[in-house]
């Protein structure tokens, strides 16, 4: 769902952990659209709390009303709380905005568990720690919800950054980023650096800590090391990509690559976990268990339910394997791989940890809606959503959590034939995109 597994996500501190930082390689990528180099005003503009989403501060209406808005590349509506709710400290008050326009239309968004509904309108929107512009954008004013807002999460709305095809109630409702690009000179590109803490944060620390950066209109080179590798956006709805191979500690899962993308593979900042299709998940867990077989963990741990706790500072990262996903490259028969560490896929849980313990949840889970590259993946990398060139870039994040032995990696090129065959073609029916639920 949008919650539970689909939202909950973790935040953290910025900056390379343990003072480790990889040397920059020469940039080999061809010129990117938009401003390049430094976006100082946008760096560190995201915050978040473990498992509960990364959010950016936005203002809505005239005079401006400040709200924290969850950054979600897995949906396409800009929707904000617009009525009192026990979990909201504040909400959008349309009656106080002189620039609010009612579209006299409702919107209802059901998830597998939970839902939100509201009224559509438009208003002036800006991002204080973003580009210095104000745009008129569609806003869904959430008047009723169930299991959508999260107690203590500190965000009051959601910014869907995907494409119009998956907007509700239909694709005629222009998403925020489309409006931003249309109404300004901002290039059609944004990038995300999500910085996982790597250790549990208490509420005070989490609220005060930096969670990362959303760079609107370009790429900030201070946020990554090495070079950017790009994979094509297969279709502009979700940010859909194609995975061509999966390895656990260098061991190929040896599955038909169509299985990896059944029924799609997407990059989704609004999902906590790396979610894998059932068959792939089972094979991956079997391989991860085999790689860490000196230890045995409870069944519930592998289901993402039970927590495993180690005495503070003694987590045996070395017994857990790295996970590599090979993505279709920009050149025919060429792929590249992104590799994450257990520091990304074992998610620290702050609620139960004491000063004596570090507790973790296994953040790889099963999906019935395809592969979802959620925070577990994104926290290892600086991810560029290059909409103008219909591609997504990955580079090693300057803030990813690692140790002295291993680091997340983006490497290539690799020769991979028949990659087009790895994409799954969803049978087109009226209901094919109806299930918003991401449980």
């Amino acid at each position: 769902t949008h919650l539970g597994i689909r939202l909950p996500l973790r935040s953290g501190l910025a900056g390379p952990p343990l003072g480790l930082r990889l040397p920059r390689e020469t940039d080999e990528e061809s010129e990117e659209p938009g401003r390049r180099g430094s976006f100082v005003e946008m760096v560190d503009n995201l915050r978040g709390k473990s498992g509960q989403g990364y959010y950016v501060e936005m203002t809505v209406g005239s005079p401006p009303q400040t709200l924290n808005i969850l950054v979600d590349t897995g949906s396409s509506n800009f929707a904000v709380g617009a009525a009192p709710h026990p979990f909201l400290h504040r909400y959008y008050q349309r009656q106080l905005s002189s620039t609010y326009r009612d579209l006299r239309k409702g919107v209802y968004v059901p998830y597998t568990q939970g839902k939100w509904e509201g009224e559509l309108g438009t208003d002036l929107v800006s991002i204080p720690h973003g580009p210095n512009v104000t745009v008129r954008a569609n806003i869904a004013a959430i008047t009723e919800s169930d299991k959508f807002f999260i107690n203590g999460s500190n965000w009051e709305g959601i910014l869907g950054l995907a494409y119009a095809e998956i907007a509700r109630p239909d694709d005629s409702l222009e998403p925020f980023f489309d409006s931003l690009v249309k109404q300004t000179h901002i290039p059609n590109i944004f990038s995300l650096q999500l910085c996982g803490a790597g250790f549990p944060l208490n509420q005070t620390e989490a609220l005060a800590s930096v969670g990362g950066s959303m760079i609107i209109g370009g790429i900030d080179h201070s946020l990554y090391t090495g070079r950017l590798w790009y994979t094509p956006i297969r279709r502009e709805w979700y940010y859909e990509v194609i995975i061509v191979r999966v390895e656990i500690n260098g061991q190929d899962l040896k599955m038909d690559c169509k299985e990896y993308n059944y029924d799609k593979s997407i990059v989704d900042s609004g999902t906590t976990n790396l979610r894998l299709p059932k068959k792939v998940f089972e094979a991956a867990v079997k391989s991860i268990k085999a790689a860490s077989s000196t230890e045995k963990f409870p069944d519930g741990f592998w289901l993402g339910e039970q927590l495993v706790c180690w005495q503070a500072g003694t987590t045996p990262w070395n017994i857990f394997p790295v996970i590599s996903l090979y993505l279709m490259g920009e050149v025919t028969n060429q792929s590249f791989r992104i590799t994450i560490l257990p520091q990304q896929y074992l998610r620290p849980v702050e609620d139960v940890a004491t000063s004596q313990d570090d507790c973790y949840k296994f953040a790889v889970s099963q999906s019935s809606t395809g592969t979802v590259m959620g925070a577990v993946i994104m926290e290892g990398f600086y991810v560029v959503f290059d909409r103008a060139r219909k591609r997504i870039g990955f580079a090693v994040s300057a803030c990813h959590v690692h140790d002295e032995f291993r680091t997340a990696a983006v490497e290539g090129p690799f020769v991979t034939a028949d990659m087009e065959d790895c994409g799954y073609n969803i049978p087109q029916t009226d209901e094919s995109t109806l299930m918003t639920g991401r449980a």
């Epitope: 045995k296 963990f297 409870p298 927590l307 706790c309 609620d351 139960v352 507790c359």
Partner: antibody, heavy 120, light 108 residues
Framework: QLQLQESGPGLVKPSETLSLTCTVS??????????WGWIRQPPGKGLEWIGM???????WYNPSLKSRVTISVDTSKNQFSLKLSSVTAADTAVYYC????????????WGRGTLVTVSS | EIVLTQSPATLSLSPGERATLSCRAS??????LAWYQQKPGQAPRLLIY???KRATGIPARFSGSGSGTDFTLTISSLEPEDFAVYYC??????????FGGGTKVEIK
């Protein structure tokens, strides 16, 4: 059917090391489905988890006892053992060995227990 | 650290009566909770695991319910052999080291 039996001295002097062995009969200690654990119960009090071991030798200990506890396994003898060093009167208890099953979470089979008294 | 609080400390009932024992966790443990029975001079015995599943050989009069923070062990009709001490244990955090303080069910 599988049974567990604790053995070892019933009296240990303060500052010495308490040593107990649990013998598993009717099944293999090398099963990949179980951990093997030690729990103790001071007279008239509740249960305290001491630690557990996997047949591979991987161990988990109660942090409050970790500096004094060693649990080991001997698969050839189908036994696992507990050593608790520098004992005091507070370590006087009935010591139980148990199997950790049901998804490697619950103590689904217990030995009868053995009372160890720490006294000079 | 998750703390398990059992209540009441002692429950005085007669054979044939219904016993309701409570175990409250200081924070959610999902359904990862067990109940054990310990008779005088004996080792504990697993009764219920995963909050509501009866262990092998446990009579149907024993049932467990609850999830999150509040759990209940119910003995529908007390038999003479049911008078004992009952402990709950959470394994939401693993290794499985947290037990409740126990509830003694005694004959009235």
């Amino acid at each position: 059917q599988l049974q567990l039996q604790e053995s070892g001295p019933g009296l240990v002097k303060p500052s010495e090391t308490l040593s107990l062995t649990c013998t598993v009969s009717g099944g293999s200690i090398s099963s990949s489905s179980y951990y093997w654990g030690w729990i103790r119960q001071p007279p008239g009090k509740g249960l305290e988890w001491i630690g557990m071991i996997y047949y591979s030798g991987s161990t988990w200990y109660n942090p409050s006892l970790k500096s004094r506890v060693t649990i080991s396994v001997d698969t050839s003898k189908n036994q696992f053992s507990l050593k608790l060093s520098s004992v005091t009167a507070a370590d006087t208890a009935v010591y139980y060995c148990a199997r950790v099953g049901h998804g490697i979470s619950y103590f689904d089979l217990w030995g009868r227990g053995t009372l160890v008294t720490v006294s000079s | 650290e998750i703390v398990l609080t059992q209540s009441p400390a002692t429950l005085s009932l007669s054979p044939g009566e219904r016993a309701t024992l409570s175990c409250r966790a200081s924070q959610s443990v999902s359904s990862y909770l067990a109940w054990y029975q310990q008779k005088p001079g004996q080792a504990p015995r697993l009764l219920i695991y995963d909050a509501s599943k009866r262990a092998t050989g446990i009579p149907a009069r024993f049932s467990g319910s609850g999830s999150g923070t509040d759990f209940t062990l119910t003995i529908s009709s007390l038999e003479p052999e049911d008078f004992a001490v009952y402990y709950c244990q959470q394994v939401y955090t693993w290794p499985p080291r947290t037990f409740g303080g126990g509830t003694k069910v005694e004959i009235k």
